[in-house]
Interface confidence: low
């Protein structure tokens, strides 16, 4: 079952999954000036059997040289639905990508892919948050969000993280990045 909405947004933080549950879809997005090949799949799908999980389909981008290359490639309507985003930059080394049963690893990059990956997560998925460069976590401890099914509706749990600026005036310095100490604290609703 797909999660109905995006993982919570946290100001000055990005999220990433260590592994992706079977059923997760990743849009085949291309960077500016490129588009998905006509015959190409609109998404990759994490599938598997009891012993192995892998991504079905391959994303392929081709030059859109004849087109107006100043426009971002617009996803098809079905791709826009329930967009799940995660920043590619600041890739988080949250854990070695250990093979988890029923999970796929981070898909390898494809040529000319977009800088932002758009995932469609499924119930039971966990994503992990980390402050972007120049910001530090106010509280220790891992910050994670889990997509859960409650009373027939999906929801993401609130991650325990607030990122404070190291250089912004009026902000106090943060602390060292969390190292999975047990007493992490909260999250933020953030401006959207």
């Amino acid at each position: 079952e797909l999660c109905d909405d995006d993982p919570p947004k946290i100001t000055h933080a990005t999220f990433k999954a260590v592994a992706y549950k079977e059923g997760t879809m990743l849009n085949c997005e291309c960077k500016r000036g490129f588009r998905r090949i006509k015959s190409g799949s609109p998404y990759m799908l994490c599938t598997g059997n009891s012993s192995h999980s892998s991504w079905d389909n391959q994303c392929q981008c081709t030059s859109s040289a004849a087109r107006n290359t100043t426009k971002q490639v617009t996803p098809q309507p079905e791709e826009q639905k329930e967009r799940k985003t995660t920043e590619m930059q600041s890739q988080m080394q949250l854990a070695d990508q250990v093979s988890l049963p029923g999970h796929c690893r981070e898909p390898p990059p494809w040529e000319n892919e977009a800088t932002e990956r758009i995932y469609h997560f499924v119930v039971g998925q966990t994503v992990y948050y980390q402050c972007v460069q120049g910001y530090r976590a106010l509280h220790r401890g891992p910050a994670e969000s889990v997509c859960k099914m409650t009373h027939g509706k999906t929801r993401w749990t609130q991650p325990q993280l607030i990122c404070t600026g190291e250089t912004e005036p009026s902000q106090f310095p943060g602390e060292e990045e969390p190292q999975a100490s047990p007493d992490g604290l909260p999250e933020s609703e953030t401006s959207r």
């Epitope: 100001t11 106010l138 509280h139 220790r140 609130q158 325990q160 607030i162 404070t164 009026s170 902000q171 106090f172 310095p173 943060g174 602390e175 100490s181 047990p182 007493d183 992490g184 604290l185 909260p186 999250e187 933020s188 609703e189 953030t190 401006s191």
Partner: antibody, heavy 118, light 111 residues
């Protein structure tokens, strides 16, 4: 039992120095922030600042920055609030409180009454 | 930083419901879900009754509920009881990495 035990009431003269304490017990005291809150007689709560005893990382309210010093000794699970030169306007009840898992102060000390009078 | 704005006092009879508002800015109440509420009985330290806008710590009656819209948070106490008479304070984490309290609201249970 999780608790914060604060030092006893103090009566001081203007210009004197003072250090009051707050000892945490019943939990991993180096893993939680401890905040200090002032309540002047008949008035509301004012957040003064906060410290992480594990490494003494400290933040202050702009209103109290430079007026007080917050410190901690993690070896004895104790946080401190101190003044180098008290004023009559420092007369108040001072509470320490633990910042719990959701940015709320979940455990409070009983308070230390500080009276500054000539 | 300015204190969050609360009504100085509210009063109601036992069994009734009351709502106390707490108005801040987009840098505190409006920025995060970190709004908490405290009850302070006369001569006692404050006691946490709600956190994350509307969550109750264990042992807190479900007569206490909270909500937030924009820069204003609200505490509602239903089925008022005589021992609810106390001062109530809201608090919010701020974008400056600090906390701020409301000025407090004195609740009187008529009776």
């Amino acid at each position: 039992q999780v608790q914060l035990v604060q030092s006893g009431a103090e009566v001081k003269k203007p210009g004197e120095s003072l250090k009051i304490s707050c000892k945490g017990s019943g939990y991993s005291s180096t893993s939680y922030w401890i905040g200090w809150v002032r309540q002047m007689p008949g008035k509301g709560l004012e957040w003064m600042g906060i410290i992480y005893p594990g490494d003494s990382d400290t933040r202050y309210s702009p209103s109290f920055q430079g007026q007080v010093t917050i410190s901690a000794d993690k070896s004895i699970s104790t946080a401190y609030l101190q003044w180098s030169s008290l004023k009559a306007s420092d007369t108040a009840m001072y509470y320490c409180a633990r910042l719990g898992s959701y940015y709320a102060f979940d455990i409070w000390g009983r308070g230390t009454m500080v009276t500054v009078s000539s | 930083q300015s204190a969050l704005t609360q009504p100085a006092s509210v009063s109601a009879s036992p069994g009734q419901s009351i709502t106390i508002s707490c108005t801040g800015t987009s840098s505190d109440v409006g920025a995060y879900i970190y709004v908490s509420w405290y009850q302070q009985l006369s001569g006692k330290p404050p006691k946490l009754i709600l956190y994350d806008v509307s969550k109750r710590p264990s042992g807190i009656s479900d007569r206490f509920s909270g909500s937030k819209s924009g820069n204003t948070a609200s505490l509602t106490i239903s089925g008022l009881q005589a021992d609810d008479e106390a001062d109530y304070y809201c608090s919010s984490y701020t974008r400056s990495s600090t906390w701020v309290f409301g000025g407090g609201t004195q609740l009187t249970v008529l009776g």
